[in-house]
């Protein structure tokens, strides 16, 4: 759905979100240009590109909430992920840069869809809330009461350290869009909350 | 192979019915959202019905007083009941798969089509 | 319902050369999907997701865009090429698609 609209068709709706959780589970849509704009693409600098543990929620701790709680976790999830993106912004090589050191401009390009995409996906949960009639949900726009704060990185003046953050913090957001996108592919073909 | 074969169509007159058929092969329609998507004569397309997996249905609100989707799961066939047809009903009937069990409304696999004319 | 506007309604080139198609919601759309149709055939899926290459579908395809406007660019036209694409959107209920463009030989 576009920013500030919401679709009153539950499984129109509830395709959107699947689309937009199957995208962004694809490594090749975030993790891979980042690994390779922040020159980490060597298999042993891969190799400390590891999730952090407790970064997101897990699966089996997803699956154990309803439906509202669910989105309310995903929704909350989703405003930490959009801090962390707009710091990791911050910190990229800038185009002119790229393009001297002869890496490809769409990786970039692909790294500044994320935050844009994401925020289309939580519009979309706020508006599946709302069609669940889940009244109290924080509109995606504002700060939401009880919102954990974002992950912050370590303080580090290691530029490299930083990036290895990156890295492990975008190998987790992957996992945990998986584990989304799985529950979603589970929700039914009615709108009735009962059914989980 | 994944195919689709659609029959039924024919010379019909205004006001009468038909009842047109999808013979899914190469997949089960109870694992995929199969939809109905109609062109008239040198005309764009026009999305019409779907039948999700579990079998709830969506319809175009242009459509849906007058046509019913429905599939038969031991035959693995979907059907399109068409009453109270009028001239501009006229149109090729094709019938097309999403592209997995999700709720996707795009439509990877299309059958060949089968004609329907209104005229009296 | 969005409505999808193509342009041009027809387009003229010849073999070899780039063809860019335009799609234009009349509200902003998620993704947009593109179809290939030739004369008494069935469309056949191009595009998905915006920008996607559906399977079989060949590296001279691409899809771009965002917000209400997108392009399907051909890039090294090929005589198969030639026939009517339509642009396809479902973030608004019912899925619409455009009323098509014809890539015509010149």
């Known amino acids: 759905a576009a920013m500030g609209s919401c679709s009153k068709e539950y499984r129109m709706l509830l395709g959107q979100l699947q689309k937009q959780t199957d995208l962004m589970q694809d490594t090749s849509r975030l993790l891979d240009p980042y690994i390779r704009i922040q020159g980490l693409d060597i298999p042993k600098l891969r190799e400390h590109c590891r999730e952090s543990p407790g970064a997101f929620p897990s699966e089996e701790t997803l699956r154990g909430l309803g439906r509202r709680g669910f989105l309310q976790t995903l929704n909350a999830t989703l405003g930490c992920v959009l801090h962390r993106l707009a710091d990791l912004e911050q910190h990229l090589p800038k185009a002119q840069d790229l393009e001297r050191s002869g890496l490809n401009i769409e990786d970039l390009e692909k790294l500044q869809m994320a935050r844009p995409n994401v925020l289309g996906l939580r519009n979309n949960v706020y508006c599946m809330a709302q069609l669940l009639d889940n009244s109290d949900m924080t509109e995606p726009t504002k700060a939401g009461r009880g919102t954990p704060q974002p992950p912050t990185p370590t303080p580090t003046s290691d530029v490299f350290q930083r990036k290895l953050e990156g890295c492990s913090f975008l190998r987790g957001y992957h996992r945990f869009m998986h584990s989304v996108g799985r529950i979603f592919s589970k929700w039914g073909e009615s709108p009735n909350r009962s059914r989980r | 192979q994944v195919q689709l074969v659609e029959s039924g169509g024919g010379v019909v007159q205004p006001g009468r019915s038909l009842r047109l058929s999808c013979a899914a092969s190469?997949?089960?329609?109870?694992?995929?959202?199969v939809h109905w998507v109609r062109q008239a004569p040198g005309k764009g397309l026009e999305w019409v019905a779907v039948i999700w997996r579990g079998g709830s249905t969506d319809y175009n609100a242009a459509f849906m007083s007058r046509f019913t989707i429905s599939r038969d799961n031991s035959k693995n066939t979907l059907y399109l009941q068409m009453n109270s047809l009028r001239a501009e009903d006229t149109a090729v009937y094709y019938c097309a798969k999403s592209p997995n069990s999700n709720f996707y409304w795009y439509f990877d696999v299309w059958g060949r089509g089968t004609l329907v004319t209104v005229s009296s | 319902e969005i409505v999808l506007t193509q342009s041009p309604a027809t387009l003229s080139l010849s073999p070899g050369e780039r063809a860019t198609l335009s799609c234009s919601g009349s509200s902003s759309v998620s993704y947009m999907y593109w179809y290939q149709q030739k004369p008494g055939q069935a469309p056949r899926l191009l595009i998905e997701?915006?920008?996607n290459l559906a399977s079989g579908i060949p590296a001279r395809f691409s899809g771009s865009g965002s917000g209400t406007d997108y392009t399907l660019t051909i890039s090294n036209l090929e005589p198969e090429d030639f026939a009517v694409y339509y642009c396809q959107q479902w973030s608004s209920y019912p899925p619409t698609f455009g009323q098509g463009t014809k890539l015509e030989i010149k």
């Open positions: 190469g997949f089960s329609l109870t694992n995929y959202g």
């Open positions: 997701d915006t920008s």
